[in-house]
Interface confidence: low
C-alpha cells in the first residue's frame, strides 16, 4: 500500500489507475534551497541538477565532523518528498537544488537572499514554464528576507516555505510570515498538528494550510537506495510543492493567486483536531490539509474565495488592523471580530488604489482583528457605498443602485463606544437583496460589484435565544463572500468566514444576562458566477 | 500574512545629519530604520543587508556602497562588500562595526538596514 | 527474513520494573511506527503503546500512562518498553508489532510473558 | 473511547459452510478525507501471535487467503469466512485504528461444529 502520506493528499476520486500520473508535474521546475544533496539516489537520479550555488556558514563547533550522508540528509529526503519515483508527490517534476544550509542544517539571511536572486537571475536569462521554490526553512521575522519573497513571486514565481517547527506563531518568523509565500504547517496521520520532541509545527494566521508532516517516508542520503523516515513543516511543505507543481503542470497559466486559492478550495476541511493550538490562534489558524485536485481540470468555473485575517490591532482606544488580499483579488467583503466584544466594527476604504479591510477598536477592548474575504473575480469592477447613521429607528440601510453591481458584502462602523442592543424591528424587507442594514448608530457599508455573470443572494440564519455561536452557510455550487452579523449590539464579538460558513460570535450569554431581544442573525451573501461556468463548458 | 511593518524589533536611528558632512541627507521626511531578528541566539552581529529605495539602480547600489566604505576608513574601520543585490531588491551586503550603522544609515538612497540572521532546517 | 522478536520478560514483584527489548529484522525500522501490544492470560488484545518512526511521538494507553516509556533506538533497530511500578494486572504476554504507519498492525513478534506477583 | 464489540462470543460453523462475525464500533472510524474505514480484522490460532487478514475494513493482507472477506462502512462491519477450513480455526479480532488509543473487540472463538 502506498505511504499514508501519499494516501492522505490523494482525494478518493482517484481510480487506482489514476493516481498521480507518472509525469505528473513535468511541465514544472522546483528550486530547492536547502542543505547538499545526493543527486544519485535512485529516488531522485535524473531529475534533480544540482546547480552551482552555494552559500553557507562555517559549522559550529570544532569536533564537528563532516560526514556527507548527513550533510546532504534534509535536501535529499526533501527532493524526494517533491518529485521522487516512488514516494514522490509530482514524479514528473524535475527540480535544481541550492545550497543554502550547512551540515548542520543552518544557513542565513544572507545566503537565503542571494540564493533567491540566482533565482531570478537564471529566470531571466533563461525563461522556462512555470517556477516553484521551496523554502524549507525558517528563522526570525526578516523584513528584507519577506521583501525579497514578495519580489519574487510578483515576478510570476510560486514560493512555498516550512512555517517552522518552534510551535509558535507562524507570525514570528520569516519566510514564513510572508503575505505573498504559500506557507504550510505539519499534521500527522491521525491529522493531529505535528508534535516534534517538546514542539511542534507553528501555527496562525500566517499558516496558508496543512500538509502530512510527521513519519514521511522519503530518500536516505546513507545510501543511493536507502529510505528513511523524517518529520517536519519542511516535510509538509514540499508536499505542498508536489502538489503546486502537479496543478501548474495541469494549467500553466495559473497565477499565485489561483494556485493558492485552489490549494485551499481542494484541501480536505475542517479534519485537524483543533484543541492542540492555543485558544487565542484556533480562530485564525486555518483548518486545511492539503489534497491534490480530483481531477486536473475542470475548476475553472469555481468562484474562489478565502478569509485573510489581519495583525491583532494592539489595545489602544483609536488602535486599527488592517487585512488585506493579493494584487489579483478582489475583496468583496470586510469583517470584525474582537474577544472582549469591544470594537466599533469596519469598513472597506481604499489604500494605494485597492480596497482594504480596516477594523476599529473601541475604549476598555483588548484589541480587534480585521477579517477580508478575498475572491477571484475576472473583469471585476467593485466599489464601496456608505450610508452614515440614519439616526431612525429603523436602523441605517444602504443598497447597490447602479445598473448591474450586486451585493457581495456588508460592513458597519460606528463612532460611539456602546451601540446598545437597540435593534432595528425590520431587519431586511424581501425582495430587497442588495441591501445592508444596520443598527441606527452606525455607519453602513456596502461593498457592490460588476463582474460578467455575478449573481448573489442573501441567507440569513436567525436564533431566537441569545447564542455564543450562529452559523448560516451557502449551499453547493454558491460561493460565501460576505459574513455579517444583525444586529450589531455590543455583545456580539464579531463575524467571520470559515471556508463556505459565516461564523458569529457573541459573549457567554450565562455571564452577561442576554434577553431574547438581543437575539442574533447570521447574514451570508452567497454568490456564484454564470459566466466563468458557461466559460468552462466552452473549453470541454 | 504578516504586514511588512509588522512584528519584528525595530530600532530607528534618527538622523541628524549635522554630525557627519560627510553623509548626504535622505530626501526629506523619511528615516531610514535599523531592523534585527529578535531571537537574540540566531542574530550574526557584523554583517548587515543594506537594502536601498525601491528605483535604486545597480550602478547606484555600487557607488553607495563604496561611500559608506570610504566614509568607514576615514572613521580607521574596515569594512568588506561581500555581495551588491540586484535582479530582486536593490542593495549590498556589508561585513562590518556595528558602531557603523549610524553612518551608514544616512547614506543617500538607503531605504533600511537589517543585521544578518540565521536560518534552519525545518 | 522479516521479524520481530521480543525478550525482556519474566517475574517481578509488585512495585518493581522491568525492560523489555524488541529486535527488528528484515524491513526499514526507521520507516515504520512500532507499537506493544498485550495479552492477559485467557483475555483480549490490549493496545499498550505507540511510538513514531522517528521517535518524536509516543503515545500511550490510560492504564500505563506515568509508569510506561516506549523507546526505539534506530542503530540497533530495537524497540523498547521500560515498565515501572508494575501491578498484578499488568500480567500479559507482550507483543511487539510493526505498524502499517496507520495504525492497524501488519507484523507481531511470539511475544515475551510478564508475571507481576508476590 | 472508541468501544469495539463484536458478536457472537464464539460460533461454530461445518466445514465448508459460512462464517460470519460482526464488529461494531461507538462512533464512526470512516475518514471522511480519504474515504477510509480504520478498521483491521485479525486472526489468532492458540499459542500464536495475531495476524492481519484485512485492513481498511475491506482490503485483504498480502497472502490471506480469498475466502476471507470484510465489509461495512461507518460503525458496522463484518468479516466473512465464505468457506470454512480445518485450519481457520482461531480467534478472531476487530481494531480501529481511526484514532488512540487503539483499541480491539473483545475477539470471537470460531470453532468447527
Known amino acids: 500500500s502506498i505511504p499514508w502520506n501519499l494516501e492522505r493528499i490523494t482525494p478518493p476520486r482517484y481510480r487506482a489507475d489514476e493516481y498521480q500520473p507518472p509525469d505528473g508535474g513535468s511541465l514544472v521546475e522546483v528550486y530547492l534551497l536547502d542543505t547538499s544533496i545526493q543527486s544519485d539516489h535512485r529516488e531522485i537520479e535524473g531529475r534533480v541538477m544540482v546547480t552551482d550555488f552555494e552559500n553557507v556558514p562555517e559549522e559550529d563547533g570544532t569536533r564537528f565532523h563532516r560526514q556527507a550522508s548527513k550533510c546532504d540528509s534534509h535536501g535529499t529526503h526533501l527532493a524526494g518528498v517533491v518529485s521522487g519515483r516512488d514516494a514522490g508527490v509530482a514524479k514528473g517534476a524535475s527540480m535544481r537544488s541550492l545550497r543554502v544550509l550547512n551540515c548542520q542544517g543552518k544557513g542565513t539571511v544572507s545566503g537565503t537572499l542571494i540564493g533567491l536572486e540566482f533565482i531570478r537571475k537564471s529566470q531571466l536569462v533563461q525563461p522556462v514554464g512555470p517556477l516553484v521554490v521551496l523554502l524549507p526553512l525558517a528563522g526570525g521575522y526578516s523584513r528584507v528576507l519577506n521583501a525579497a519573497c514578495q519580489r519574487l513571486a510578483r515576478a510570476g514565481v510560486v514560493l512555498v516555505t516550512a512555517a517552522g517547527n518552534f510551535r509558535d506563531d507562524a507570525c514570528l518568523y520569516s519566510p514564513a510570515s510572508a503575505p505573498e509565500v504559500i506557507t504550510v504547517g505539519a499534521t500527522n496521520a491521525q491529522d493531529q498538528p505535528v508534535t516534534l520532541g517538546t514542539l511542534g509545527t507553528n501555527f496562525g494566521r500566517c499558516v496558508d494550510l496543512f500538509a502530512p508532516g510527521e513519519d514521511i517516508i522519503g530518500a536516505s542520503s546513507d545510501c543511493s537506495t536507502c529510505f528513511v523516515s523524517q518529520s517536519g513543516t519542511s516535510q509538509a511543505a514540499a508536499h505542498v510543492a508536489g502538489i503546486a507543481a502537479m496543478m501548474l503542470s495541469a494549467e500553466p497559466e495559473l497565477t499565485l493567486a489561483e494556485l493558492r486559492q485552489r490549494l485551499i478550495h481542494f484541501s480536505a476541511k475542517d479534519v485537524i483536531n483543533e484543541a492542540w493550538f492555543p485558544e487565542d490562534q484556533r480562530v485564525l489558524t486555518p483548518n486545511l490539509v492539503a489534497a491534490l485536485p480530483p481531477s486536473t481540470h475542470g475548476a475553472g468555473w469555481q468562484l474562489f474565495c478565502r478569509t485573510v485575517w489581519s495583525a491583532h490591532s494592539g489595545p489602544t482606544r483609536m488602535a486599527t488592523a488592517i487585512a488585506r488580499c493579493a494584487p489579483d483579488e478582489e475583496l468583496l467583503s470586510c469583517s470584525s471580530f474582537s474577544r472582549s466584544g469591544k470594537r466599533r466594527g469596519e469598513r472597506m476604504e481604499a489604500q494605494g488604489g485597492k480596497l482594504v479591510c480596516r477594523a476599529h477598536n473601541a475604549f476598555g477592548g483588548e484589541g480587534v482583528y480585521a477579517i477580508a474575504r478575498c475572491c477571484l473575480l475576472p473583469q471585476a469592477n467593485c466599489s464601496v457605498h456608505t450610508a452614515p447613521p440614519a439616526e431612525a429607528s429603523m436602523g441605517t440601510r444602504v443598497h447597490c443602485h447602479q445598473q448591474g453591481h450586486v451585493l457581495t458584502g456588508c460592513s458597519s462602523h460606528w463612532e460611539v463606544e456602546d451601540l446598545g442592543t437597540h435593534k432595528p424591528p425590520v431587519l431586511r424587507p424581501r425582495g430587497q437583496p442588495n441591501q445592508c442594514v444596520g443598527h441606527r448608530e452606525a455607519s453602513i457599508h456596502a461593498s457592490c460589484c460588476h463582474a460578467p455573470g455575478l449573481e448573489c443572494k442573501v441567507k440569513e440564519h436567525g436564533i431566537p435565544a441569545p447564542q455564543e455561536q450562529v452559523t448560516v452557510a451557502c449551499e453547493e455550487g454558491w460561493t460565501l463572500t460576505g459574513c455579517s452579523a444583525l444586529p450589531g449590539t455590543s455583545h456580539v464579538l464579531g463575524a467571520y468566514a470559515v471556508d463556505n460558513t459565516c461564523v458569529v460570535r457573541s459573549r457567554d450569554v450565562s455571564t452577561t444576562g442576554s434577553t431574547s431581544e438581543e437575539a442574533v442573525t447570521a447574514v451570508a451573501i452567497c454568490c456564484r458566477s454564470r459566466h466563468l461556468a458557461q466559460a468552462s463548458q466552452e473549453l470541454q | 500574512q504578516e504586514d511588512e511593518d509588522g512584528d519584528y524589533e525595530e530600532l530607528v536611528l534618527a538622523l541628524r545629519s549635522e554630525e557627519d558632512g560627510l553623509a548626504e541627507a535622505p530626501e526629506h521626511g523619511t528615516t531610514a530604520t535599523f531592523h534585527r531578528c529578535a531571537k537574540d541566539p540566531w542574530r550574526l552581529p557584523g554583517t548587515y543587508v543594506v537594502v536601498l529605495k525601491e528605483e535604486t539602480h545597480l550602478s547606484q547600489s555600487e557607488r553607495t556602497a563604496r561611500r559608506l566604505q570610504a566614509q568607514a576608513a576615514r572613521r580607521g574601520y574596515l569594512t568588506k562588500i561581500l555581495h551588491v543585490f540586484h535582479g530582486l531588491l536593490p542593495g549590498f551586503l556589508v561585513k562590518m562595526s556595528g558602531g557603523l550603522l549610524e553612518l551608514a544609515l544616512k547614506l543617500p538612497h538607503v531605504d533600511y538596514i537589517e543585521e544578518d540572521s540565521s536560518v534552519f532546517a525545518q | 527474513e522479516v521479524q520481530l522478536v521480543e525478550s525482556g520478560g519474566g517475574l517481578v514483584q509488585p512495585g518493581g520494573s522491568l525492560r523489555l527489548s524488541c529486535a527488528a529484522s528484515?524491513?526499514?525500522?526507521?520507516?515504520?511506527?512500532m507499537n506493544w501490544v498485550r495479552q492477559a492470560p485467557g483475555k483480549g488484545l490490549d493496545w499498550v503503546s505507540t511510538?513514531?518512526?522517528?521517535?518524536?511521538?509516543?503515545n500511550y494507553a490510560d492504564s500505563v500512562k506515568g509508569r510506561f516509556i516506549i523507546s526505539r533506538d534506530s542503530s540497533k533497530h530495537t524497540l523498547y518498553l521500560q515498565m515501572n511500578s508494575l501491578r498484578a494486572e499488568d500480567t500479559a504476554v507482550y507483543y511487539c508489532?510493526?505498524?502499517?504507519?496507520?495504525?492497524?498492525?501488519?507484523?507481531w513478534g511470539r511475544g515475551t510473558l510478564v508475571t507481576v506477583s508476590s | 473511547d472508541i468501544v469495539m464489540t463484536q458478536s457472537p462470543d464464539s460460533l461454530a460453523v461445518s466445514l465448508g459452510e459460512r462464517a460470519t462475525i460482526n464488529c461494531k464500533s461507538s462512533?464512526?472510524?470512516?475518514?471522511?478525507?480519504?474515504?477510509?474505514?480504520?478498521l483491521g480484522w485479525y486472526q489468532q490460532k492458540p499459542g500464536q501471535p495475531p495476524n492481519l487478514l484485512i485492513y481498511?475494513?475491506?482490503t485483504r493482507e498480502s497472502g490471506v487467503p480469498d475466502r476471507f472477506s470484510g465489509s461495512g462502512s461507518g460503525t458496522d462491519f463484518t468479516l466473512t469466512i465464505s468457506s470454512l477450513q480445518a485450519e481457520d480455526v482461531a480467534v478472531y479480532y476487530c481494531?480501529?485504528?481511526?484514532?488512540?488509543?487503539?483499541?480491539f473487540g473483545q475477539g470471537t472463538k470460531l470453532e468447527i461444529k
Open positions: 528484515g524491513f526499514t525500522f526507521n520507516n515504520y511506527a
Open positions: 508489532a510493526k505498524d502499517s504507519n496507520w495504525g492497524n498492525f501488519d507484523l
Open positions: 481498511w475494513a475491506s
Open positions: 481494531q480501529q485504528y481511526y484514532t488512540t488509543p487503539y483499541t
Open positions: 462512533q464512526s472510524v470512516l475518514y471522511r478525507s480519504n474515504n477510509r474505514n480504520f
Open positions: 511510538i513514531s518512526g522517528s521517535g518524536g511521538t509516543t
